[in-house]
């Protein structure tokens, strides 16, 4: 476990021409705040993918009002560090997104308004416990200067915060096979604890809580032998051996949850629901009471009345989980409609809407036809965030700019012949038929069939004949 720390040094216009306009004005004073999002690895991930390593939001900076006529200076910044705690190992390589947000403090209807001023992103290698790394990133005409570092929280040490240190039990040396903890020479490395139940013969770990299998073994605890029978399994050959993996058990098969925990499958893996008094990924941490301080992030521990309720954590706003170990990402409530992008700003949820949609939750389909003209007498029909034109006769295409063959749809009934005409089309009817589309038979006595109902309709039905 540890903390990633980010220190913003300055945010202001970058060098070169085209200095940006100040984001604040006398009419609209504003202040800045920052959001950092961390993801493990060096993958080029979309801005909206989850901040799997964590995220943090800064405090608000001082209120700033532009001096008329002055160029945008470096803007006043919030005090303090942005801190992103991580519970597991520090990955060493990570991706970051730092967003600069503006809070407008004018007379907004419904309170202050937020807007994204700049977003920078990057991919870096960083060892925990190292010195501050300095960086400069540009976003358009803006420049952001910042430093960052990752540090381990005791008792963890090392470049990945995976080695654990304990005070020496004897003053002279550490136990068998355990090294002193540099730079804390008066402490010793604690033995590595693999995932509970990890097979001692067929499994091993390089980080606490993991269980990696030796060749020929599989399963979450390395207790399942890899089948060496002929490859009939739909899974195909295993890369680890010449044999095949037996068809994969479901993530809850064999119930990986210890201590009476119940397993439920999730799209990506499984989740253990632990009885009170147990916690951990597989309910493997046991016998916990409030005296053990099981509630993270300032959660309030309340002792239960019976053994099944050894404790319960009442989480502060912003945290959830049996032990308040998870940061609440309120975007997981899926509040944004019509493909809007959700931003949990800590104090509020914001939806960034796709083109054609608006509203706090992107629920309003904008008038797609506003400002859109359909040529040649076409009429605009809106829907689904995109406009389309219903074209007048003789025209087609997205905006009715293309000439269409009006006779292509064979509009003349009863063998009538169609002629394209500048005003549309003309039907030359076969003998015995009449009407704009040759739709009406002519009576033998020469009278038109117009007053009578077409076949299949009773006289008096409210049909209009054209």
């Amino acid at each position: 476990a540890g903390v990633f720390e980010l220190q913003i040094h300055s945010f202001g216009p970058g060098p070169g021409p085209g200095a940006p306009r100040s984001p604040c004005s006398a009419r609209l004073p504003c202040r800045l705040f920052f959001r950092v999002c961390l993801k493990p690895g060096l993958s080029e991930e979309a801005a909206e993918s989850p901040c799997a390593l964590g995220a943090a939001l800064s405090a608000r900076g001082p209120v700033y009002t532009e001096q008329p006529g002055a160029p945008a200076p470096d803007l006043p910044l919030p005090d303090g560090l942005l801190q992103v705690p991580f519970r597991d190992a520090w990955p060493g390589t990570f991706s970051f997104i730092i967003e600069t947000w503006r809070e407008e403090l004018g007379d907004q209807i419904g309170g202050p308004a937020w807007s994204l001023l700049a977003r920078v992103a990057g991919r870096r290698r960083l060892a925990a416990g190292g010195p501050w790394a300095r960086d400069i990133q540009r976003a358009g005409a803006w420049e952001l200067r910042f430093s960052y570092r990752a540090r381990c929280e005791p008792p963890a040490v090392g470049t990945a915060c995976t080695r654990l240190c304990r005070p020496r039990s004897a003053p002279s040396r550490c136990g068998p096979g355990l090294r002193p903890c540099a730079p804390l020479e008066d402490e010793c490395e604690a033995p590595l604890v693999c995932r509970a139940g990890c097979s001692p013969e067929h499994g091993f770990c390089e980080q606490p809580g993991e269980c990696r299998c030796l060749e020929g073994w599989t399963g979450p605890l390395c207790t399942v032998p890899v089948s060496t029978s002929s490859c009939l399994s739909p899974r195909g050959p295993s890369s680890a051996t010449t044999g095949c993996l037996v068809p994969g058990p479901g993530p809850c098969d064999g119930n990986p949850c210890a201590n009476g925990g119940s397993c439920s499958e999730t799209p990506r893996s499984f989740e253990c629901t632990c009885p009170r008094g147990f916690y951990g990924l597989r309910c493997e941490v046991s016998g916990v009471t409030c005296a053990d301080g099981p509630c993270f992030n300032g959660g309030l521990c309340v002792g239960g009345a019976d053994p099944d309720s050894a404790y319960i954590c009442h989480c502060p706003p912003g945290f959830q989980g049996s032990n308040c170990e998870k940061r609440v990402d309120r975007c997981s409530l899926q509040p944004c409609r019509n493909g809007g992008l959700c931003l949990d700003l800590g104090h509020a949820l914001r939806c960034r809407c796709r083109a054609g949609f608006a509203g706090p939750r992107c629920e309003h389909d904008l008038d797609d036809c506003a400002g859109r003209a359909c040529a040649n007498g076409g009429t605009c029909v809106e829907g689904g965030g995109a406009h389309r034109c219903s074209c007048a006769l003789g025209f087609g295409g997205r905006d009715c700019r293309e000439r269409a063959d009006p006779c292509a749809a064979r509009p003349c009934a009863h063998g009538g012949r169609c002629y394209a005409h500048f005003s549309g089309l003309v039907c030359a009817c076969a003998p015995g038929y009449m009407g704009a589309r040759c739709e009406f038979p002519v009576h033998p006595d020469g009278a038109s069939a117009l007053p009578a109902a077409p076949p299949g309709l009773r006289p008096g039905d409210p049909q209009r004949y054209l």
Epitope: T266, P317, S332, L333, Q334, R337, C351, E363
Partner: antibody, heavy 117, light 107 residues
Framework: QIQLVQSGPELKKPGETVKISCKAS????????MHWVKQAPGKGLKWMGW????????GYADDFKGRFAFSLETSASTAYLQINNLKNEDTATYFC??????????WGQGTSVTVSS | DIQMTQTTSSLSASLGDRVTISCRAS??????LHWYQQKPDGTVKLLIY???RLHSGVPSRFSGSGSGTDYSLTISNLELEDIATYFC?????????FGGGTKLEIK
Amino acid sequence: QIQLVQSGPELKKPGETVKISCKASGYTFTDYSMHWVKQAPGKGLKWMGWINTETGEPGYADDFKGRFAFSLETSASTAYLQINNLKNEDTATYFCARYDGYAMDYWGQGTSVTVSS
Amino acid sequence: DIQMTQTTSSLSASLGDRVTISCRASQDHSNYLHWYQQKPDGTVKLLIYYTSRLHSGVPSRFSGSGSGTDYSLTISNLELEDIATYFCQQGDMLPWTFGGGTKLEIK
């Protein structure tokens, strides 16, 4: 039209497990989170938490941590509520409800769970 | 947690009456205040969301208002089908919380 159809009533003994289903239709299931609400006999409504239908990640209110589990079968547009180690105080009607970004706009008809020895 | 209080647990009114049901929050919050109707058969429906917006298909005799900590639901012309229990709910801060409910009966 939008519908949430829940499984039928359940009669269970203390210590047993129950799993209630909520089948959604009339909309894209993975676009809206699903929420669960408890109503004890003669009492008001109590929000239990939600599950993100895109990722499967649940969130539980404090009183529903431990024995309660939300899960999904996305291919069947179905959400589940599982209650383990049932107690008498779990006797209630449980509702699933869709969240539209403002409020819980459509609700299931409710599933009655009775726990009695 | 934000506590929601509906001081009137039951209310009698005559058909055609204008009925107002109130709800108070323990702390100031934004307008994510919603009203639900639970019929005697147990079915629950959303009536009003975001303080004053009418959910689709809900008759226009229902309206909502309020801000800060005090909110109300008004039925302008009571009909027989409005016999139900009405709950307010805040959706601003987790955990979401409901009022205790107001049961509406006909005199």
